[in-house]
Interface confidence: medium
């Protein structure tokens, strides 16, 4: 015998209070499978979350986080402060940068400087808590006659040393 | 599938009382650090507190020290919050979080699974 709550679409649960027929899910509750005997209750975004989707009676609410927050954690389950360029974020909040490493977004951690003469560059432009360096010509192109500059190495990963 | 499952989170008065539990699953969980954060509705994440993989070195935030324990039973997969004398600014939801190595890190990035969360209510 086929279940008679397998027929109840998403939007509805298999009420057994009245012969197990298919009811619409309560205001700030949805169920987004068929089959459902009861509906999950809505996600509300509240205090640093905010909402990216309205609760549906199919899908629940969507969160993301207010300005100077970003989400963390699956579905935006938590919101972590943003810190300033130039910064980074630790267990205990907002720390500049070390000497020697840079971040230019109001997010993530603090990367080393390029070693420009790893690639035998010389520094046209010292890095700050905010920039990485730029890397100028070699030694080497300073001869007289010599006039192209050659553009920056790229940002190293989050986390990596050079080498 | 490695997962972590939180519990014990509740209503309590000032001053009282709780025990949080998360339950781990998935991983060798006496390998890895272990995290509890929480977030208050109106702030962003605040760290509470790590323990190492051993259990032999544990971490605190000012906020807690003296008045938050943390523990693990490497026999049970669980991590443990002792919440003790709780205040009104301790109400959160609470979030357990695996860390990716044996000893603490000082970032999130260290983080590679969290836990659903419990929520935890104090109030007269």
């Known amino acids: 015998l086929q279940d008679p709550c397998s027929n109840c679409p998403a939007g509805t649960f298999c009420d057994n209070n009245r012969n197990q027929i298919c009811s619409p899910c309560p205001p700030n509750s949805f169920s987004s499978a068929g089959g459902q005997r009861t509906c999950d209750i809505c996600r509300q975004c509240k205090g640093v979350f905010r909402t990216r989707k309205e609760c549906s009676s199919t899908s629940n609410a969507e969160c993301d986080c207010t300005p100077g927050f970003h989400c963390l954690g699956a579905g935006c389950s938590m919101c972590e402060q943003d810190c300033k360029q130039g910064q980074e974020l630790t267990k205990k909040g907002c720390k500049d940068c070390c000497f020697g490493t840079f971040n230019d977004q109001k997010r993530g951690i603090c990367r080393p400087w390029t070693n420009c003469s790893l690639d035998g560059k010389s520094v046209l432009v010292n890095g700050t808590k905010e920039r990485d360096v730029v890397c100028g010509p070699s030694p080497a192109d300073l001869s007289p006659g010599a006039s192209s500059v050659t553009p920056p190495a790229p940002a190293r990963e989050p986390g990596h040393s050079p080498q | 599938e490695v997962q972590l499952v939180e519990s014990g989170g509740g209503l309590v008065q000032p001053g009282g009382s709780l025990r949080l539990s998360c339950a781990a699953s998935g991983f060798t969980f006496s390998s890895f650090a272990m995290t509890w954060v929480r977030q208050a509705p109106e702030k962003g994440l605040e760290w509470v507190s790590t323990i190492s993989g051993s259990g032999d070195t544990t971490y605190y935030a000012d906020s807690v020290k003296g008045r938050f324990t943390i523990s693990r039973d490497s026999s049970k997969n669980t991590l443990y919050l002792q919440m003790n004398s709780l205040r009104a600014e301790d109400s959160a939801v609470y979030f357990c979080?695996?860390?990716?190595?044996?000893?603490?890190?000082?970032?999130?990035?260290?983080?590679?699974?969290w836990g659903q969360g419990t929520t935890v209510t104090v109030s007269s």
């Open positions: 979080a695996k860390e990716a190595t044996a000893m603490a890190s000082d970032y999130y990035y260290g983080v590679d699974v």
